[in-house]
Interface confidence: medium
């Protein structure tokens, strides 16, 4: 029995004075606690606890379930204990079958013995199956068998406590080990969409998916730069062992412009944290913004092709698109398509394909688009470059030679005189008058230029050339002169195309 210095409170003394006591089933357990300040006896085994306020604990007919630790406590809180084994060949183990452990921690298989003198106290797999090779355990007859450093692979492992009794192996009831996984990585988080664009009053709903090994992962939606608690709804599933999924849905039933911003789905476990964001933009009304992909003033050569291309942002989605020229709507020759197949796409492309344009097809080509909120339009001014065409070349009554040419860009008219029979007309003649005339055709059509020279300047036989040219090409007309005495005659005016 313990001895202490006089004057100090001492722990109670127990009779019989030994740390362990073995009795047979059916025998009497008689324990005496001696202490002037006796308070109580406490009995503990597994999760069971009993108390007795008498200083003598008597169990007349001991049963296996009376196996356990008997503790006597005095008024000073000092105590002394004795462990009693009630040997019952028919009940070698006391069991609490709830067996669970945290990964990488130790866990106790609670199968204390009723007889400490049996041998080979150990664990065995169910149905003769071997235990995992790396499973290590430490037996303790009073507590059970401690499994060291539980592995995730042990989850749902079926096992028995086992002892050898009189040369035979005796098994306890079976235990199923349930392993709670340790967090060895941060949660995996993803969001239904990275960005949202809404009109005021529309519902904003976004779902964050959190995946982890167990349901103890924490998650929440947060508004960046705000502490306000957001309303969220959860659903969760266990997809088998160690595969937990939670969906956290954030909803704003009627979004306002000031709800715009960045929302973060945050998740953490004991290993670390992860987050993902989504951006909400709320506009007071829809919009359309058009961006021309080519210059809105277009120059194209006669007979060539041109594509008029626009990109536009439209929210809500576009409902009507059309291309118009001279108050006529194109029914074909154009296509309209989304810039991407992304669900949140608001950018679209429209292309008008103009083929083998004629000089008469210049003008304003307009793209119109509308949605439920707004209309928008953009105009392209298309100029068709044409080589000059000489419309008239005449000798006027007043003796002037006049040449009228049309083309785009505006033609320049030069005059040349070829004396006699020379083929090359190199001597240039300055015009008396040059005028740009208003065309009676559509706008963006050919420009008409009129140029005149005074024929009295010519004193010899020869040919006068009127040459009209621009960036596209040139055309000439010729006046042949022959002198008869003092009279000058214009003979056979004719044109020659000079490429």
């Amino acid at each position: 029995q313990p001895s202490v210095s006089p004057g100090e409170p001492s722990p109670p003394s127990i009779h019989p004075g030994k740390s362990d006591l073995i009795v047979r089933v059916g025998d009497e357990i008689r324990l005496l606690c001696t202490d002037p300040g006796f308070v109580k006896w406490t009995f503990e085994i597994l999760d069971e606890t009993n108390e007795n306020k008498q200083n003598e604990w008597i169990t007349e007919k001991a049963e296996a379930t009376n196996t356990g630790k008997y503790t006597c406590t005095n008024k000073h809180g000092l105590s002394n204990s004795i462990y009693v084994f009630v040997r019952d060949p028919a009940k070698l183990f006391l069991v609490d079958r709830s067996l669970y452990g945290k990964e990488d921690n130790d866990t106790l298989v609670r199968c204390p013995l009723t007889d400490p003198e049996v041998t080979n106290y150990s664990l065995k797999g169910c149905q003769g199956k071997p235990l995992p090779k790396d499973l290590r355990f430490i037996p303790d007859p009073k507590a059970g068998i401690m499994i060291k450093s539980v592995k995730r692979a042990y989850h749902r492992l079926c096992l028995h406590c086992s002892v050898d009794q009189e040369g035979k192996s005796v098994l306890s009831e079976k235990f199923i080990l349930k392993v709670r996984p340790a967090f060895k990585a941060v949660p995996v988080v993803s969001v239904s969409k990275a960005s949202y664009l809404l009109r005021e009053g529309e519902e904003f709903t976004v779902t964050c998916t959190i995946k982890d090994v167990s349901s103890s992962v924490y998650s929440t939606w947060k508004r960046e730069n705000s502490q306000t608690k957001l309303q969220e709804k959860y659903n969760s599933w266990h997809h088998g062992d160690f595969n937990y999924e939670r969906q956290a849905t954030l909803t704003i039933s009627s979004a306002r412009v000031n709800d715009s911003g960045v929302f973060m789905c945050y998740a953490n476990n004991t290993f670390g944290s992860a987050n993902v964001t989504t951006t909400l933009e709320v506009v007071d009304k829809g919009f359309i913004n058009i961006f021309p992909m080519i210059n809105t003033t277009v120059f194209v050569n006669d007979g060539e092709n041109v594509d008029l291309i626009v990109e536009y942002e439209a929210f809500p989605k576009p409902e009507h698109q059309q291309w118009i020229y001279m108050n006529r709507t194109f029914t074909d020759k154009w296509e309209d398509y989304p810039k991407s197949e992304n669900e949140s796409n608001i950018r679209y492309v429209s292309e008008l394909h103009l083929t083998r344009l004629k000089g008469t097809e210049g003008g304003t080509y307009t793209f119109l688009v509308s949605n439920s909120d707004v209309n928008a339009a953009i105009a392209f001014n298309v100029y068709v470059n044409t080589k000059p065409e000489i419309l008239t070349y005449d000798r006027l009554v007043n003796g002037m030679l006049q040449c009228v040419a049309a083309g785009f860009p505006e033609p320049t008219i030069d005059w040349y005189f070829c004396p006699g029979t020379e083929q090359r007309c190199s001597a240039s003649v300055l015009p008396v008058d040059v005028q740009t005339l208003n065309s009676s055709g559509p706008p963006f059509g050919k420009l008409v230029v009129q140029s005149s020279i005074d024929s009295s300047a010519f004193k010899h036989n020869g040919t006068v050339e009127c040459k009209a040219y621009n960036d596209v090409g040139k055309t000439s007309a010729y006046f042949n002169f022959a002198f008869k005495g003092n009279n000058k005659e214009q003979i056979h005016p004719h044109t020659l195309f000079t490429p």
């Epitope: 167990s214 349901s215 266990h238 939670r246």
Partner: antibody, heavy 120, light 107 residues
Framework: EVQLLESGGGLVQPGGSLRLSCAAS????????MSWVRQAPGKGLEWVSA????????YYADSVKGRFTISRDNSKNTLYLQMNSLRAEDTAVYYC?????????????WGQGTLVTVSS | DIQMTQSPSSLSASVGDRVTITCRAS??????LNWYQQKPGKAPKLLIY???SLHSGVPSRFSGSGSGTDFTLTISSLQPEDFATYYC?????????FGGGTKVEIK
């Protein structure tokens, strides 16, 4: 001893409010998710709401969503259920229960229940 | 929500009888299935968790089996204190659901 003790039940008129409390003892309260489960007279069990150990995550049955709010105060070891816009069909015995994550999320500890009667 | 269908809704049996109660889930819930016992005027008590694991302190005459969608609670030898109502419950989804209950009465 592990124990849950509900309080706050009583008679309330339709449209009224009531706040139930559940005092926990004998275990590490903040380590466990908690739930409310109800049982209408002569009927079966119906899960109402749940809350994670930290209080960060809450769950509700469709029948009470928007009307009931579950919360907890881990410093006081207490679980709450705020019930607003009560209806006659909310009449039931309300139990609080501890959800044990180890055990297939089973409710391993239950309170004795508190009766809520919604009637005019 | 996952529907849990229990059968039968009630049964009469004698002490010593073997009693079997079945529970069917409307979708695969693996082994996330628990069984409870409730006596009149009392709170439910957990009997079986994880479809087949016996909860601490529950007599070994109770056993559970099954996985996926079909589950069974068996009482190998009915005792007088076992007359009660039994409920199954799925915890696979966060929206927890119970079966309708099976009342075990004395024949």
């Amino acid at each position: 001893e592990v124990q849950l003790l509900e309080s706050g039940g009583g008679l309330v008129q339709p449209g009224g409010s009531l706040r139930l409390s559940c005092a926990a003892s004998g275990f590490s309260f903040s380590s466990y998710a908690m739930s409310w489960v109800r049982q209408a007279p002569g009927k079966g069990l119906e899960w109402v709401s749940a809350i994670s150990g930290t209080g960060g995550n809450t769950y509700y049955a469709d029948s009470v969503k928007g009307r009931f709010t579950i919360s907890r105060d881990n410093s006081k070891n207490t679980l709450y259920l705020q019930m607003n816009s009560l209806r006659a069909e909310d009449t039931a015995v309300y139990y609080c229960a501890r959800r044990n994550d180890f055990w297939s999320d089973a409710f391993d500890i239950w309170g004795q229940g508190t009766l809520v009667t919604v009637s005019s | 929500d996952i529907q849990m269908t229990q059968s039968p809704s009630s049964l009469s049996a004698s002490v010593g009888d073997r009693v079997t109660i079945t529970c069917r889930a409307s979708q695969n819930i693996y082994t996330y299935l628990n069984w409870y016992q409730q006596k009149p005027g009392k709170a439910p008590k957990l009997l079986i968790y994880d479809a087949s694991s016996l909860h601490s302190g529950v007599p070994s005459r109770f056993s559970g089996s099954g996985s996926g969608t079909d589950f069974t609670l068996t009482i190998s030898s009915l005792q007088p204190e076992d007359f009660a109502t039994y409920y199954c419950q799925q915890s696979y989804s966060s929206s927890i659901t119970f079966g309708g209950g099976t009342k075990v009465e004395i024949k």
